[in-house]
């Protein structure tokens, strides 16, 4: 079945931009002017999801490349990384729930948490030019809140 | 005052073309969904069709091919273009926005624009 | 597609009674499920969405349930100021967006 999608870029609260750190790995720092478009287009999906009142479940693809942010174990840690994905089949409505986000949205801050591991969020470092990754707290010193920018073509 | 004021409608011949307007006010459109449905007079709501970035728009079955929805977030502005118009798209039009990305309903409305097909 | 049919099209009640009205999807939506109350020549007004969850300032006397495919909206104690047009709304259908017909909420 189709899905909806639309074209963005996310920004972290301190204003952080999400760039390409390599061929599998996002990181966070502050861009401006020309540099602005170094940032991930991220084409977000609506997807299918365990039933919430708050959460909206979508999957984060990078635009334009068979590439989606999932959540797996590694070394019994929940992780965040870039998998590879056959483009002919992708996006879906019924999404892996590796892939699956839950997106929580409070005025205008949005919060990604995993699907597969409940209380794990897409998360930023306070630090600059630190990799993009899968915490599990909130309101500690990680960043877990996120403003969306619509991506015009 | 947080609102969606639409605009443009009227009367219009059968196979012409309009365009309607949603300005918004209090708040910024750029990064908001915005849903065009209407209302034929005496009948339920139907929706036309939403956009999210000025690529990503989906309309009903119906609609597609003859409804058009852009913006001009400059503006704070969405659209509806219509063509080839009929009488049975006589309605009032009302703009939404999206509760939440996603979410598929709509918190906010406007007052709707009447649009009348009629030789 | 996915169709929501309303039932019943025109209820008639009076103030105090307990009303409910019932939505059926042709297939599973899970919970992606809203409710509208519209008034005649204004715009319609958002009262509950994901079923169950009540819209900001709306009054605690509605309330949703289901899931699934079967849903309803139930007002507790109906008030001068319910009288009005129901409508349920799919909001979780793929690439589109449905309403149900309506139901017309009349004074007995």
């Known amino acids: 079945a189709p899905v909806r999608s639309l074209n963005c870029t996310l920004r972290d609260s301190q204003q952080k931009s999400l760039v390409m750190s390599g061929p599998y790995e996002l990181k966070a720092l502050h861009l401006q002017g020309q540099d602005m478009e170094q940032q991930v287009v991220f084409s977000m999906s609506f997807v299918q999801g365990e039933e919430s009142n708050d959460k909206i479940p979508v999957a984060l693809g990078l635009k334009e490349k068979n590439l989606y942010l999932s959540c797996v174990l590694k070394d019994d840690k929940p992780t965040l990384q870039l998998e590879s994905v056959d483009p002919k089949n992708y996006p879906k409505k019924k999404m892996e729930k590796r892939f699956v986000f839950n997106k929580i949205e409070i005025n205008n801050k949005l919060e990604f948490e995993s699907a597969q591991f409940p209380n794990w969020y897409i998360s930023t470092s306070q630090a600059e030019n630190m990799p993009v990754f899968l915490g599990g707290t909130k309101g500690g010193q990680d960043i877990t809140d996120f403003t969306m920018q619509f991506v015009s073509s | 005052e947080v609102q969606l004021v639409e605009s443009g409608g009227g009367n219009v011949q059968p196979g012409g073309s309009l365009r309607l307007s949603c300005t918004a006010s209090?708040?910024?459109?750029?990064?908001?969904?915005m849903a065009w449905v209407r209302q034929a007079p005496g009948k339920g709501l139907e929706w036309v069709g939403i956009i999210y970035d000025s690529a990503s728009t989906y309309y009903a079955s119906w609609a597609k091919g003859r409804f058009t929805i852009s913006r001009d977030n400059s503006k704070n502005t969405v659209y509806l273009q219509m063509n080839s118009l009929r009488a049975e798209d006589t309605a009032t039009y009302y703009c939404a926005r999206e509760r939440a990305i996603f979410s598929g309903d709509f918190a906010l409305w406007g007052q709707g624009t009447l649009v009348t097909v009629s030789s | 597609e996915i169709v929501m049919t309303q039932s019943p099209s025109t209820l008639s009640a009076s103030v105090g009674d307990r009303v409910i009205i019932t939505c059926q999807a042709s297939?599973?939506?899970?919970?992606?499920l809203s409710w509208y109350q519209q008034k005649p020549g204004k715009a319609p007004k958002l009262l509950i969405y994901?079923?169950?969850t009540l819209a900001s300032g709306v009054p605690s006397r509605f309330s949703g349930s289901g899931s699934g495919a079967e849903f309803t909206l139930t007002i507790s104690s109906l008030q001068p100021d319910d009288f009005a047009t129901y409508y349920c709304q799919n909001t979780g259908g793929g690439v589109s967006i449905a309403f149900g017909q309506g139901t017309k909420l009349t004074v007995l």
């Open positions: 994901r079923a169950s």
């Open positions: 297939q599973s939506i899970d919970n992606w």
């Open positions: 209090g708040f910024s459109l750029s990064n908001s969904a």
